[in-house]
């Protein structure tokens, strides 16, 4: 029985150009964690294997660092970034858990419009 | 001014499908989100799911996959979500809704989809 | 998927009165940056839902100010200084931190 649950950053609001890190937590179980896949819609960004350590897809290897921890660095963002990113963790013996995260990236012009966050 | 027009109701049989319209205007349609949301008995909101018009990616509620398909035209500023194998619990009214920074800005004006044979 | 809950269900008021509703959420609805995705939106009769407050506290252009939204982590409020005839309707609240976003069941809020 699958008992673990994936903590994930939240949905990340960012202006085009800047960087922002992807982050899952696996918890509430005890299965090892044998990879972690990042994937966005149905590209394959990175993978991080237990034993091999880390490999970014070669289109991305220019704006994706590796961490911190099993999460993923992106850099210079583009509105073309905008979308949904997956972590998936393959353990054992539960299988597969997966965390689902969105990511907005504005053009600065559109940041500077509608719906603005106050600083505190 | 923001406008999101959505296309007229809908009696279909059970068993088809169908294709609601959204039409904006007023804004950079590729510079925003495109959600769609289903309101049932006049009361309950769900999120459907949503689209990126600049690059055609989608995001969904599980609970619609495989019963909603979000596309968009970016030669006409229109978004559509398509309903597919309609039963009674498909009946219900579904509004689209741009969003910025994951909150939703500006509301279609609804599409009623009665379900019945 | 994060639930959302509201209170009360049904709120009766008389113009003038000031009115709580509160939303809930069964996670903490801040990101690993600080920002908390959680909106309130007034749906009137006949009309499409419209947005009031944005990321806990922001009122929406064109909202006016006695509508008021606080809270934090999971427990979120929104205020009503004076209610006025326009104010009546269902009111609900939205988390889009986590996927998929969810919303609250409705407060209506009618007269008395």
């Known amino acids: 029985m699958m008992t673990g649950t994936i903590e994930t950053t939240g949905n990340i609001s960012a202006e085009k150009g800047g960087s922002i890190i992807l982050q899952c937590h696996l918890s509430s179980t005890t299965a090892q964690v044998t990879q972690v896949n990042w994937e966005q819609q149905d590209q394959l960004l990175a993978i991080c294997n237990a034993d091999l350590g880390w490999h970014i897809s070669p289109s991305f290897k220019d704006r994706v660092a590796p961490g911190p921890g099993l999460g993923l660095t992106l850099q210079s963002l583009t509105v073309n970034d905008t979308g949904e990113y997956f972590c998936i963790y393959h353990t054992y013996p539960d299988g597969t858990y997966t965390g689902r995260i969105f990511l907005e990236v504005l053009e600065s012009s559109v940041a500077e419009h509608g719906a603005r966050f106050q600083i505190p | 001014e923001v406008q999101l027009q959505q296309s007229g109701p809908e009696l279909v049989k059970p068993g088809a499908s169908m294709k609601i319209s959204c039409k904006a205007s007023g804004y950079s349609f590729t510079g925003y989100i495109m959600n769609w949301v289903k309101q049932s008995h006049g009361k309950n909101l769900e999120w459907i799911g949503l689209?990126?018009?600049?690059?055609?990616?989608?995001s969904y509620n599980q609970k619609f996959k495989g019963k909603a398909t979000l596309t968009v035209d970016k030669s006409s500023n229109t978004a559509y979500m398509e309903l597919l194998s309609l039963t009674s619990e498909d009946s219900a009214v579904y509004y689209c809704a741009r969003s910025l920074r994951f909150s939703f800005d500006y509301w279609g004006q609804g599409t009623t989809l009665t379900v019945s044979s | 998927d994060v639930v959302v809950t509201q209170t009360p269900l049904s709120l009766p008021v008389s113009f003038g009165d000031q009115v709580s509703i509160s939303c809930r959420s069964s996670?903490?609805?801040?990101?690993?940056?600080?920002?908390?995705?959680l909106s309130w939106y007034l749906h009137k009769p006949g009309q499409s839902p419209q947005l009031l407050i944005y990321g806990i506290s922001n009122r929406f252009s064109g909202v006016p100010d006695r509508f008021s939204g606080s809270g934090s982590g999971t427990d979120f409020t929104l205020k009503i200084s004076t209610v006025k005839p326009e104010d009546l309707g269902m009111y609900y609240c939205?988390?889009?931190?986590?996927?998929?976003?969810?919303f609250g069941g409705g407060t209506k809020l009618e007269i008395k």
């Open positions: 939205l988390q889009n931190t986590h996927q998929p976003p969810t």
């Open positions: 689209i990126v018009p600049n690059n055609g990616g989608t």
């Open positions: 996670q903490s609805l801040a990101n690993s940056y600080g920002t908390t995705y």
